[in-house]
């Protein structure tokens, strides 16, 4: 399964025209229309922590 190009969506509430800015440890969750705590990943092949890259199986920092 190849990597897909991410379709970047506006970080806006469906009932608001004001974009939501989140701090570094957060990201925008469209479901709750707000900034939430966001985890980074360790990729299995490198062990590096990064933002999510499409098309890869990933290992969260905090084990499940």
């Amino acid at each position: 399964m190849g990597a897909r190009r991410l379709r970047v969506r506006s970080q806006r509430s469906r009932d608001s025209s004001v974009p939501t800015q989140c701090n570094q440890t957060e990201c925008f969750d469209p479901l709750v229309r707000n900034c939430v705590s966001c985890e980074l990943f360790h990729t299995p092949d490198t062990g590096h922590t990064s933002s999510l890259e499409p098309g890869t199986a990933l290992q969260p920092q905090e084990g499940s």
């Epitope: 379709r7 970080q11 990201c27 969750d29 479901l31 707000n34 939430v36 990943f41 999510l52 499940s64």
Partner: antibody, heavy 125, light 107 residues
Amino acid sequence: EVQLVESGGGLVQPGGSLRLSCAASGFTISSSSIHWVRQAPGKGLEWVAWVLPSVGFTDYADSVKGRFTISADTSKNTAYLQMNSLRAEDTAVYYCARRVCYNRLGVCAGGMDYWGQGTLVTVSS
Amino acid sequence: DIQMTQSPSSLSASVGDRVTITCRASEDISSSVAWYQQKPGKAPKLLIFSASFLFSGVPSRFSGSGSGTDFTLTISSLQPEDFATYYCQQSEVSPPTFGQGTKVEIK
């Protein structure tokens, strides 16, 4: 270790009330959204409500709106579901779950990664 | 509300088979789909999130694909422990809605 433990289920008559609790450990509920999902006997999953404790945002399924209230006490790291005016069709196992978010270019990519064991609510006369 | 239509509702398969389950959203939900596995009497388990990302600890025989309105969960080689019910769920907009489920049974 992340854990969610529900309690408060039981047998109640139609029109009655119950309060379910979801005690979290291993993470802080204020950093995530907490969801209640139910499953009637032999049926599929039905989302009920969510709360974002950090700001108090909530939302509800149409089937429970006006009857159920979701809340959270961050000092107790616990979420609640107050269920009033219960009906036979509310009979189900009720699960609480945490929504995890991973950073996908500033936007949440996630799902419900931890679930409680479930608590059975039976509405019957 | 966004409707998630899963198909088939049930299927019979043998160990080693390739199994595909589809989920169709009533409107564009980008890639905001998760897939869950549930066994009788147990809570659901997260398999795939954001349409194609394998959750931690999930075997690589599970994969997900799709975007927009059409999504697929594939089990490349069915194992005995994979006989269960599978659900898709959208989280693009509240309320988050589940598909009706697909029961994978032993042939």
